[in-house]
């Protein structure tokens, strides 16, 4: 669809005569008839197949024709067509004299014709005017013409219909050839597909409007490139959706079991060394001078009664000091200046001379010890505490501080490791000499039955089109992560590509 436009510019008829040579009375009141038709090698009369148009009287004899496109569209003359422009044409322009006001062909005498010109040729669609001038013996006509497409028609022959639009069936304007030019943010054959936020993951993200990034199930983040871990995952991460890969020092299905109590809680005091010994279990190795499960108790160095021969012990910042009784000397009052004559043996001890009286030795009665029988027997020296229990002197008595897992006066009783129900997911606990063992129900494994090995929802390969399957361990269901070009809960549906234009 388009318009053949003819711009009449100047008509010269200096003598004011008709084609017959007869003069017009009083002058040639001139109007034009235009016939546009298909190309003819020799332009002949016949139907004006592309259209006709007539003008009113434009002037007398010789005159210039005013451009009147703004005031009614009379000049240029418009010859619209509703077909593909063929690129060739024939044009007949007749100048007629109008004796009266009736310009209909049947109302005019045949000799009212002033001049007739006929041209033919090629004409491409375009904005540029072609200027032409036709001269006969008595007249001259200057004019220009062109073919342009109607609104919304494009292409070399005005055959491509294109209407700009900005709705959900397309976001585009039309190029001169009728092809679509997508508005910013849109793509696709009809510019109906939004361009997602730059960097939005191709498979895991999508969008319904430009610069948006909406995440598919199992993914999160601004660009949908972060997987969502298993629901309830505490100290773990994922590389694919619904995983829970534990951080260092954590274990269990939800990575909520502390396997590195030492690092996470630093329970050992006073510079002691901490060793992990199981879930929420640890052992502190105390530095000298400290005791207690967490080495929280400061141990007096005099508690071990290092001073012999009745020497009295004094604690000092950097150790201890022995104050020796008369007749003794040395770091621990271990050297004697006495002999049996000095009655050095206390608590009924018997004295025996040694080295020809230069030295002596005391034989102590029961419950006493020391080189001078000056010490009551330390009740802890016999290591009465079993199972690695720590013996503590408490005045006349003693007590055992037991290691975890043991109890009783002498730590001789084994606390059942099973008492705290360590086996997860209904596992059965068995006490062993050195710990415990869990017998796991179907679907679970691991030292504490903490690893779920339940029916793998992905085992049946429910996802189509090479999609990736993830098992949601909390519900024993699966999630399919579709490759580009497929959608659906099982990625079973291809995203259709629109067929090409029908034009």
């Amino acid at each position: 669809s388009g318009v053949f436009q003819l711009q009449l510019q100047e008509f010269i008829n200096e003598r004011g005569v008709l084609a017959s040579g007869r003069p017009c009375e009083p002058g040639c009141r001139t109007f034009f008839r235009v016939c546009l038709k298909h190309f003819q090698a020799v332009v002949s009369p016949g139907p004006c197949t592309f259209g006709t148009v007539s003008t009113p009287v434009l002037g007398t004899n010789s005159f210039a024709v005013r451009d009147d496109s703004s005031g009614g569209g009379r000049n240029p003359l418009q010859l619209p067509f509703n077909f593909t422009w063929p690129g060739t044409f024939s044009l007949i322009i007749e100048a007629w004299h109008a004796p009266g006001d009736d310009l209909r062909p049947e109302a005019l005498p045949p000799d009212a014709l002033i001049s007739k010109i006929a041209i033919q040729g090629s004409l491409a669609v375009g904005q540029n005017w072609l200027l032409d001038e036709q001269t006969s013996t008595l007249t001259r006509l200057r004019y220009s013409y062109r073919v342009i497409c109607s609104d919304n028609y494009y292409g070399d022959n005005c055959s491509r219909l294109c209407k700009k639009r900005n709705d959900h069936f397309g976001h585009y304007v039309c190029q001169p050839d009728g092809n679509l030019s997508c508005l910013p943010g849109w793509t696709g054959e009809y510019c109906q597909q939004p361009i997602c936020l730059s960097g939005c993951h191709e498979q895991n993200g999508y969008c319904s409007k430009p610069a948006e990034c909406l995440c598919r199930p199992g993914w999160q983040g601004r660009l949908c490139n972060e997987c969502i871990p298993h629901n309830g995952c505490r100290h773990g991460t994922c590389s694919t959706p619904w995983q829970c890969t534990c951080d260092e020092g954590w274990g269990g299905l939800f990575c909520d079991q502390d396997l590195n109590y030492c690092t996470h809680h630093s329970p050992c005091k006073n510079g002691a060394t901490c060793s992990n010994s199981g879930q929420r279990s640890y052992t502190c190795t105390c530095r000298p001078g400290y005791t207690g499960v967490d080495c929280e108790l400061e141990l007096s160095e005099c508690d071990s009664n290092p001073c012999r021969n009745g020497g009295s012990c004094k604690d000092q910042e950097d150790g201890y000091h022995c104050l020796c009784p008369p007749g003794y000397y040395g770091l621990h009052c271990e050297h004697s200046t006495l002999s049996c004559a000095d009655s050095p043996c206390f608590n009924g001890g018997s004295c025996r001379e040694r080295n020809q009286g230069a030295n002596y030795a005391c034989e102590c009665p029961p419950n006493f010890t020391g080189s001078n029988c000056e010490k009551k027997v330390d009740r802890c020296t016999s290591n009465p505490c079993a199972n690695g229990g720590q013996c503590l002197n408490r005045g006349p008595s003693r007590m055992c501080r037991c290691r975890p897992g043991f109890t009783g006066t002498y730590c001789e009783l084994h606390v059942s490791d099973c008492a705290r129900n360590p086996c997860a997911h209904g596992g059965t606990c068995h006490d062993l000499e050195n710990g415990l063992m869990c017998t796991c129900p179907a679907g679970f494994s691991g030292r504490r039955c903490e690893v779920r090995t339940s029916i793998d929802a992905c085992a049946s390969s429910p996802c189509f089109n090479r999609a990736t399957c993830y098992t949601d361990l909390s519900t024993d269901t699966f999630v399919c992560n579709c490759p580009y070009g497929f959608v659906g809960s099982r990625c079973e549906f291809p995203v259709g590509l629109p067929p090409s234009f029908p034009w």
Epitope: H168, Y206, V495
Partner: antibody
């Protein structure tokens, strides 16, 4: 051959919510070439466009009904649905689901057979 | 809101040409579709994008659209063409139907 089939209750009480489902058979709802629309026709009257949706869930509604309409899509079931809340007798109509083709400029080239919904107590 | 106006009815003799108009502001700048609906049946698309015919639609159906008016023309009208005809266009994101024309 692709076919559309509407389903849902034929009678709804005033002030309640009208719910209809359109099942697409013989083809996939998951194509960027189509929008899936709802159109209604009161007895003896003309057609009225309600709204449409694409496979990704982008929805467009008639402004005169927007506050009461929800259209959703379930690609796994190859279905899309219409919910119209707070219905009155004026919502009594034959409800059609249709496929609007992008390459046809949005022309609806495929229609369901329609289902009559009457709003009455 | 955008409105499309159609004559309520058009009468035509068999074999003659029926023309149904649809008018709306600057309608020529929008794509127009035409639907045929026979009693008790669902509508059928007969013209899309002003003048394009879907496959299976007879050549006697043609369309045009310029200015403020779109026209559906049925050349050599047959008895089976008796039906209601609706024009439809998109105004921004909203589908708009004409009021319908009964062709007898």
């Amino acid at each position: 051959e692709v076919q559309l089939q509407e389903s849902g209750p034929g009678l709804v009480k005033p002030s309640e919510t009208l719910s209809l489902t359109c099942t697409v058979s013989g083809g996939s709802i998951s194509s960027s070439s189509y929008y899936w629309g709802w159109i209604r026709q009161p007895p003896g009257k003309g057609l009225e466009w309600i709204g449409d949706i694409n496979y990704a869930g982008s929805t467009y509604y008639n402004p005169s009904l927007k506050s009461r309409v929800t259209i959703s899509v379930d690609t796994s079931k190859n279905q899309f649905s219409l919910k119209l809340s707070s219905v009155t007798a004026a919502d009594t109509a034959v409800y059609y689901c249709a496929r609007e083709d992008v390459k046809f400029g949005g022309g609806a080239d495929l229609w369901g057979q329609g289902t009559l919904v009457t709003v009455s107590s | 809101s955008y409105e499309l106006t159609q004559p309520p009815s058009v009468s035509v003799s068999p074999g003659q040409t029926a023309s149904i108009t649809c008018s709306g502001e600057s309608l020529g700048d929008k794509y127009v579709s035409w639907y045929q609906q026979k009693p008790g049946q669902s509508p059928v698309l007969v013209i899309y994008q002003d003048a394009m015919r879907p496959s299976g639609i007879p050549e006697r159906f043609s369309g045009s659209n310029s200015g403020d008016t779109a026209t559906l023309t049925i050349s050599g009208t047959q008895a089976m063409d008796e039906a209601d005809y609706y024009c439809q266009a998109w105004d921004m994101e909203t589908g708009v139907f004409g009021s319908g024309t009964k062709v007898t």
